[in-house]
């Protein structure tokens, strides 16, 4: 029986151009975490394997950094980064636990300010 629960940062927002840390935490189980996958919709962003360490998908290498811990740092955010992110914990012997985070990337106040006061 799966007794564990995943706590996540829930719904979060960040400014365009900035960075954000995606964090999940598995609790209430003795199961051993063997791998954590980070996914955005159906795209694999990164894998942290207990033995092999981190692997970042090539298409995200420039903007994704491993950590802290089993978390993931997204950098140079764009509005297109808005959406659902999933942490998928592979555990022995419980199986898979999944956490969901919704990220909204907002136009930065600097960008808005610049847009309003453009020099013609």
């Amino acid at each position: 029986m799966m007794t564990g629960t995943i706590e996540t940062t829930g719904n979060i927002s960040a400014e365009k151009g900035g960075s954000i840390i995606l964090q999940c935490h598995l609790s209430s189980t003795t199961a051993q975490v063997t791998q954590v996958n980070w996914e955005q919709q159906d795209q694999l962003l990164a894998i942290c394997n207990a033995d092999l360490g981190w692997h970042i998908s090539p298409s995200f290498k420039d903007r994704v950094a491993p950590g802290p811990g089993l978390g993931l740092t997204l950098q140079s955010l764009t509005v297109n980064d808005t959406g659902e992110y999933f942490c998928i914990y592979h555990t022995y012997p419980d199986g898979t636990y999944t956490g969901r985070i919704f990220l909204e990337v907002l136009e930065s106040s600097v960008a808005e300010h610049g847009a309003r006061f453009q020099i013609p």
């Epitope: 029986m1 003795t30 051993q32 063997t34 207990a50 592979h90 022995y92 012997p93 419980d94 199986g95």
Partner: antibody
């Protein structure tokens, strides 16, 4: 190369205790869950339970909750199985086995087995 | 707990025969099933994991298949060195129990 080397055969009297060791080498012990499996003479394999090598937390199968203790000494990369108040029916070969941490689990390396004989 | 029922418990076949061993789970276990071979006096070794994946170094005459809650280990052409007992094991949740075993004898 990965190896699990177990301690030698034991002959014990009923009521005594025994401690079986499983020395892991060729990999990082704390990254892979460790299991214990019992095989009584002429019988099949029984999964006794496992130990979370990352946290040291053990979990026991239903028939092995009373007199059986799994432990670890990470400084010497060794897992232990202790059985107290030995009974004749504890006579068996005991195996340690590592859980492979692919996304679909299996026991990829096994110790050679330790025969524990309980006889007056 | 989910039960595994392995059949047959014993089989005798000739060298070159195709041999099939079945393992039924009482509930769905996805592909969390492994097959092991244990030769007399030796520790078990994994043959198949994830129901169908052949372990590195295992001869290709061994294969695994699944259909719902029924899993099959097939030896396409039995060899003298295949004399052993074969076990299935579920690994989807605690307890990671084994089937009762199938002893394969060479005629």
């Amino acid at each position: 190369q990965v190896q699990l080397v177990q301690s030698g055969s034991e002959l014990k009297k009923p009521g005594a205790s025994v401690k079986v060791s499983c020395k892991a080498s060729g990999y990082t012990l704390t990254n892979y869950p460790m299991n214990w499996v019992r095989q009584a003479p002429g019988r099949g394999l029984e999964w006794m339970g496992w130990i979370n090598t990352n946290t040291g937390s053990p979990a026991y199968a239903q028939d092995f909750t009373e007199r059986f203790v799994f432990s670890l000494d990470t400084s010497v990369t060794t897992a232990y199985l202790q059985i107290s108040s030995l009974k004749a029916e504890d006579t068996a070969v005991y195996y340690c086995a590592r859980t492979a941490i692919t996304s679909v689990y299996h026991f990829d390396y096994w110790g050679q087995g330790t025969l524990v004989t309980v006889s007056s | 707990d989910i039960q595994l029922t392995q059949s047959p418990s014993f089989l005798s076949a000739s060298v070159g025969d195709r041999v099939t061993i079945t393992c039924r789970a009482s509930q769905g276990i996805s592909s969390y099933l492994a097959w092991y071979q244990q030769k007399p006096g030796k520790a078990p070794r994994v043959l198949i994991y994830g129901a169908t994946t052949l372990q590195s170094g295992v001869p290709s005459r061994f294969s695994g298949s699944e259909s719902g809650t029924e899993f099959t280990l097939t030896i396409s052409s039995l060899q003298p060195e295949d004399l052993a007992t074969y076990y299935c094991q579920k690994l989807n949740s605690h307890p990671c129990s084994f089937g009762q075993g199938t002893k394969v004898e060479i005629k």
